[in-house]
Amino acid sequence: DGCNDIFMKNEMLSASQPFAFNCTFPPITSGEVSVTWYKNSSKIPVSKIIQSRIHQDETWILFLPMEWGDSGVYQCVIKGRDSCHRIHVNLTVFEKQWCDTSVKGLPNLSDEYKQILHLGKDDSLTCHLHFPKSCILGPIKWYKDCNEITGERFTVLETRLLVSNVSAEDRGNYACQVILTHSGKQYEVLNGITVSITERAGYGGSVPKIIYPKNNSIEVQLGTTLIVDCNITDTKDNTNLRCWRVNNTLVDDYYNESKRIREGVETHASFREYNLYTVNITFLEVKMEDYGLPFMCHAGVSAAYIMLQLPAPDFRAY
């Protein structure tokens, strides 16, 4: 039939609430074109009667509301004077009770439903609401773990929830709720968002920052006791693990039997914009096998090593 086929990524949708999809393909739909929606390669177009639960509204397909049986492949055909494009959209409908079920159980959630806040920053979540002009949207309410969000750090602005000074506690399951009105009928839209916190933010550059060691060598005599501090700066609310490893194994596990090399207890000092952490490694007795081996201090995504080396011979003794 001379139409160019374009396949869109799968859309995962929540049952029992409105959903709309706009058939746009910028190079084509900018000119004089006709758009027609079909379901599952049917020859019969989707209805344009606004009272129909599923109908075409200009270039949109609108479900009021979406139901379990609506899963399938929908095609919109864009016909221009000299061109024809068929866009295939795979819609998968799932039952989702946001307050009953963990978001982890959902397959392939799109980026709209997985959002990131940056630790220590002023950041925002977006309630993605894609509907045609015929749908009137009311004010948005925001929920976290099924409780309406209140407090000085949160501000609702248009379709966004602004979060000032993001903390680790801000991770979790959020939902934005809005009442949609179409042809005098009201429908609830409830979009669940799973929010994670990233620690790539802070008082300066990427965090955490290992101040010492600096991938350096230390001269140490065979048989001596050695204590080396790992000093790390990190954001106040970080959840990073700080540890020493050798051969990709925690030193306490690697030297589990002999306990010759041990990781110390972590301490920290608090400054206005960051914490300074110290975690040491103790060599009760330096052995030959320790030389030339990188002992790695890890802090989140950051790592730095020390390497022990034998001191250069002191020729003055001769």
């Epitope: 940056h118 920053k121 002023d122 950041d123 925002s124 000085e152 501000t155 602005l157 602004l162 000032s164 000074n165 990233t198 790539r200 933010a201 802070g202 008082y203 300066g204 550059g205 990427s206």
Partner: antibody, heavy 118, light 107 residues
């Protein structure tokens, strides 16, 4: 409609002081961080200071640290910039701006001109 | 201090063209890059925040991309009102720093 109106600019001698004000309306002023940003005669933009919504944190570049102080009066929806020990390189148009999220200065005032000259 | 290198400093283009401006950070700034437009005699206007998010009311012909150190600002189908100056701002790390600006001119 969100409006920001700066005042307090003018001509001042090197070493002198000025206090800029920024009156905000049409927005819940106390919920947002605020910044002062200046534009030099060469049209270069420079960040001058930021204050958190609750007046708890203030941030400055080294070029103004110790000389400039940003403050706010949430009860009166007003932002201030106290400038001391002014230098010729501080000559600029000074804008106040409402910050929605980090770095996102969505609303700007019309600016107030500060000229430092002997 | 993070240095923001904005290029080109000036750019000639025709109406309807797609133009690209880049900002390069001297170190990783994650997504903390904002793009502003400033018309002569006017105040700066926010276009894009967090590298790729379009501010409310900004036409979709404006777009931004990038993360880390390299960022791109694009205007597709250049309009007469777009012929002006654009600035980037990094807000990952204090002090926040602006790029030097890019002045668009009509070819």
């Amino acid at each position: 409609e969100v409006m920001l109106v700066e005042s307090g600019g003018g001509l001042v001698k090197p070493g002198g002081s000025l206090k800029l004000s920024c009156a905000a309306s049409g927005i819940t002023f106390s919920r947002f961080a605020m910044s002062w940003i200046r534009q030099t005669p060469e049209k270069r933009l420079e960040w001058v200071a930021t204050i958190s919504s609750g007046d708890m944190y203030t941030y400055y570049p080294d070029s103004v640290k110790g000389r400039f102080t940003i403050s706010r009066d949430n009860a009166n929806n007003t932002l201030y910039l106290q400038m001391r020990s002014l230098r010729s390189e501080d000559t600029a148009m000074y804008y106040c701006a409402i910050m929605i999220t980090t770095g996102e200065h969505a609303y700007w005032g019309q600016g107030t001109l500060v000229t430092v000259s002997a | 201090e993070i240095k923001m290198t904005q290029s080109p400093s000036s750019l000639s283009a025709s109406l309807g063209d797609t133009i690209t401006i880049t900002c390069r950070a001297s170190q990783d700034i994650s997504v903390w890059l904002t793009w502003y437009q400033q018309k002569p005699g006017n105040i700066p206007k926010l276009l894009i925040y967090k590298a790729s998010n379009l501010h409310t009311g900004v036409p979709p012909r404006f777009s931004g991309s990038g993360s880390g150190t390299d960022f791109t600002f694009t205007i597709s189908s250049l309009q007469p009102e777009d012929i002006t100056t654009y600035y980037c701002l990094q807000s990952q790390s204090y002090p926040w720093t602006f790029g030097g600006g890019t002045k668009l001119e009509i070819k």
